[in-house]
Amino acid sequence: IWSAVFLNSLFNQEVQIPLTESYCGPCPKNWICYKNNCYQFFDESKNWYESQASCMSQNASLLKVYSKEDQDLLKLVKSYHWMGLVHIPTNGSWQWEDGSILSPNLLTIIEMQKGDCALYASSFKGYIENCSTPNTYICMQRTV
Amino acid sequence: IWSAVFLNSLFNQEVQIPLTESYCGPCPKNWICYKNNCYQFFDESKNWYESQASCMSQNASLLKVYSKEDQDLLKLVKSYHWMGLVHIPTNGSWQWEDGSILSPNLLTIIEMQKGDCALYASSFKGYIENCSTPNTYICMQRTV
């Protein structure tokens, strides 16, 4: 989080920012920034693999849910969107694109349909779906 | 929008940021920043007047919808939340807290209940509601 004095090199002037306020990012242009993570919701429907490729082309990954507190904006997301969670048939676990295992109690996984990919739904639910099904998707970029 | 070079005065070092990336804000701590506007969704239910007072106490106002393009993150908001739109009985118009009139085609106004205040719902819908009814609310702060 950036401190209260910034150099605006565009105008070469110092700007005072109240200490209760802060800048968020950096993020790709026109992405949502929240608690120093960057998010973008994509309207076009793609299958999971195409969605993953779209995020990667923007130096991002599909949504990773790692904290209900830090990501509480996800509570209010309407509809269903691909996230970066996939089923590993060999050991039956669910893991994120980066290889980490889904932490217990983060998502309620609803595994009623056949599939190896997961859609994020509001209130931290994950619906298992066929990876080839077109859906909208959420990309995420974690800032350092 | 801040240019690609920032002074991190906390560590007194320059940080290179790709030109395609930018910082957003400044915003109150832990608010959502999008296209240089700040948003916060409040879980507690308050009537319209209490919601307005809560936003004002944080140097913000209730949500103002002024652009579908600049505020397209609002498309995907789940549930219904007070925004800063009120009915002026004298001339029958809908206006924002700042006195500006609701632009045509920005919101689909749905008069489900008798009332003079409006709830924001996903996909740019406004539901008319009695101002005394408790609801969650969205505060917004526009950055300069």
Epitope: K78, E111, M112, Q113, K114, Y127 | -
Partner: antibody, heavy 118, light 110 residues
């Protein structure tokens, strides 16, 4: 096109058993959760049970728990409802349905009438 | 007694607008998508609204859905005689781990 055809309904005495079947065609049956929903004469819809795509997860309405069993045979594209210890209040048209978990696709059969009467 | 509460009947004149309410709890409507079904006499139900307010393809835009908190509503504008039917709300219930339906509302077009 998608078809769901229920069979096995009829008149049965209280305390007896009945098995309903639902033959599915026109979609990949083995990929989808399937439901039974019933409607008593002149009354509203009541959800009865759901089974996951592979039969590993089954959930029931409280009113039928312990008496009804939902099952499926994916090799035959068929859904079943085994109804034991039938009561007069189980009298209804029973619909087999694919309800939407995600999205807007739902399919219903035409229903089969079960009458429990002595 | 249905888990979701609907008025048993509503009536309105042709070309008018009518609203049907559906009240539930945080474990169903409050936390999950609401679907609305239309059932014509002697027919199976037909999906009218999904995910609170979305229209399946082929459904007239005279139908609209909304949701606030633990209540949902179905509105029908420009009423026509062919809209006479029973209407049901439905949602998944996290506590019961099952679908729950409203008791149904009979719409009469006067």
């Amino acid at each position: 096109q998608v078809q769901l055809v229920e069979s096995g309904g009829g008149v049965v005495q209280p305390g007896r058993s009945l098995r309903l079947s639902c033959a599915a065609s026109g979609f990949t049956f083995s990929s989808y959760a399937m439901h039974w929903v019933r409607q008593a004469p002149g009354k509203g819809l009541e959800w009865v049970a759901v089974i996951s795509y592979d039969g590993s997860n089954k959930y029931y309405a409280d009113s039928v728990k312990g008496r009804f069993t939902i099952s499926r045979d994916n090799s035959k594209n068929t859904l079943y409802l085994q109804m034991n210890s039938l009561r007069a209040e189980d009298t209804a048209v029973y619909y087999c349905a694919r309800l939407p978990w995600v999205g807007s696709v739902d399919y219903w059969g035409q229903g089969t009438l079960v009458t429990v009467s002595s | 007694q249905s888990v979701l509460t609907q008025p048993p009947s509503v009536s309105e004149a042709p070309r008018q607008r009518v609203t049907i309410s559906c009240s539930g709890s945080s474990s169903n409507i409050g936390n999950n998508a609401v679907n609305w079904y239309q059932q014509l006499p002697g027919k199976a139900p037909k999906l009218l609204i999904y995910y609170d307010d979305l229209l399946p393809s082929g459904v007239s835009d005279r139908f609209s859905g909304s949701k606030s908190g633990t209540s949902a509503s179905l509105a029908i504008s420009g009423l026509q005689s062919e809209d006479e039917a029973d209407y049901y709300c439905a949602a998944w219930d996290d506590s019961l781990f099952g679908w729950v339906f409203g008791g149904g509302t009979k719409l009469t077009v006067l």
